[in-house]
Amino acid sequence: AILGRSETQECLFFNANWERDRTNQTGVEPCYGDKDKRRHCFATWKNISGSIEIVKQGCWLDDINCYDRTDCIEKKDSPEVYFCCCEGNMCNEKFSYFPEMEVTQPTSNPVTPKP
């Protein structure tokens, strides 16, 4: 292990299409991968008229955009599908939207998925 970096071994799992995909709807996902790769957690969601609809959560591939991010935060301005990733066990339990280009307050507080 490399000191000073949060190892990701498991992430919160969620699949909105669990019935169609024949997966669990929610749970904890162990993160596997090649030994030389970093692993991350992620969350994908939509904002439908102010209501948060989670699409997926789980483990994510080695991705430089996720390095050293302890919190799962989407920074893109008004995407149709929100995405964030982070490092650290279960770091995707909560996720936030803080658009980089805006000066105003964030449009949504950190979100915790409903069980």
Epitope: N15, N17, R20, D21, R22, T23, E29, C31, Y32, G33, D34, F42, T44, K56, G58, C59, W60, L61, D63, I64, N65, P79, E80, V81, Y82, F83
Partner: antibody
């Protein structure tokens, strides 16, 4: 070194069956989801089916649903594709490919493929 | 199903050229976009995953960009070994779908 080796392809008549195998080595097979992707002669890539690391979850393209069955034997490090009721349009090179998770399915390693020809 | 549209379907370029291939999804797929390189008679090879991440062993002249519906694969300085067909693929939703491919040929 990661290696995937497909076998079981060949010539079969319409309505016939074939079972493809993919032998995996060089990685912990039971940690990874696996997929079958095919490519008809001179055409592009078409995803066929996928299975998660322990065989609990499977998914199929509409074009093969009800005819093809994906499975795996982690004790043998082998992925399978049972193909029934084969049609001429199933003629293709079939590749097995490794994926890390069900939801971030970048296919990072591929076998060299096995040719399935469906013809009378 | 999510449709993936690549353009152009083919292009001619010279060694050293900067080459750009685009891929458009029929709906937003966030960053669930991968690029593959395939040479005749060979299996596809992963080049870019998660829209921007370089796969292991792939030269840094390859780069990916985009999110949502519009994505780009760029080869900054085309090398002889880069002449091949390139495919985009979405992994946002089942079924996984590929673009029709872009054949990069020698001018």
């Amino acid at each position: 070194e990661v290696q995937l080796l497909e076998s079981g392809g060949g010539l079969v008549q319409p309505g016939g069956s074939l079972r493809l195998s993919c032998a995996a080595s060089g990685f912990t097979f039971s940690d990874y989801g696996m997929n079958w992707v095919r490519q008809a002669p001179g055409k592009g890539l078409e995803w066929v089916s996928g299975i998660n690391y322990n065989g609990g979850y499977t998914s199929y393209a509409d074009s093969v649903k009800g005819r093809f069955t994906i499975s795996r034997d982690n004790s043998k490090n082998t992925l399978y594709l049972q193909m029934n009721s084969l049609r001429a349009e199933d003629t293709a090179v079939y590749y097995c490919a490794r994926a890390a998770n069900w939801h971030d399915t970048a296919l990072d390693y591929w076998g060299q493929g096995t040719l399935v020809t469906v013809s009378s | 199903d999510i449709q993936m549209t690549q353009s152009p379907s083919s292009l001619s370029a010279s060694v050293g050229d900067r080459v750009t291939i685009t891929c458009r999804a029929s709906q937003s797929i966030s960053r669930y976009l991968n690029w593959y390189q395939q040479k005749p008679g060979k299996a596809p090879k992963l080049v870019i995953y998660a829209a921007t991440s370089l796969a292991s062993g792939v030269p840094s002249r390859f780069s990916g960009s985009g999110s949502g519906t519009d994505f780009t694969l760029t080869i900054s300085s085309l090398q002889p070994e880069d002449f091949a067909t390139y495919y985009c693929q979405q992994s946002y939703d089942n079924p996984l779908t590929f673009g029709g491919g872009t054949k990069v040929e020698i001018k």
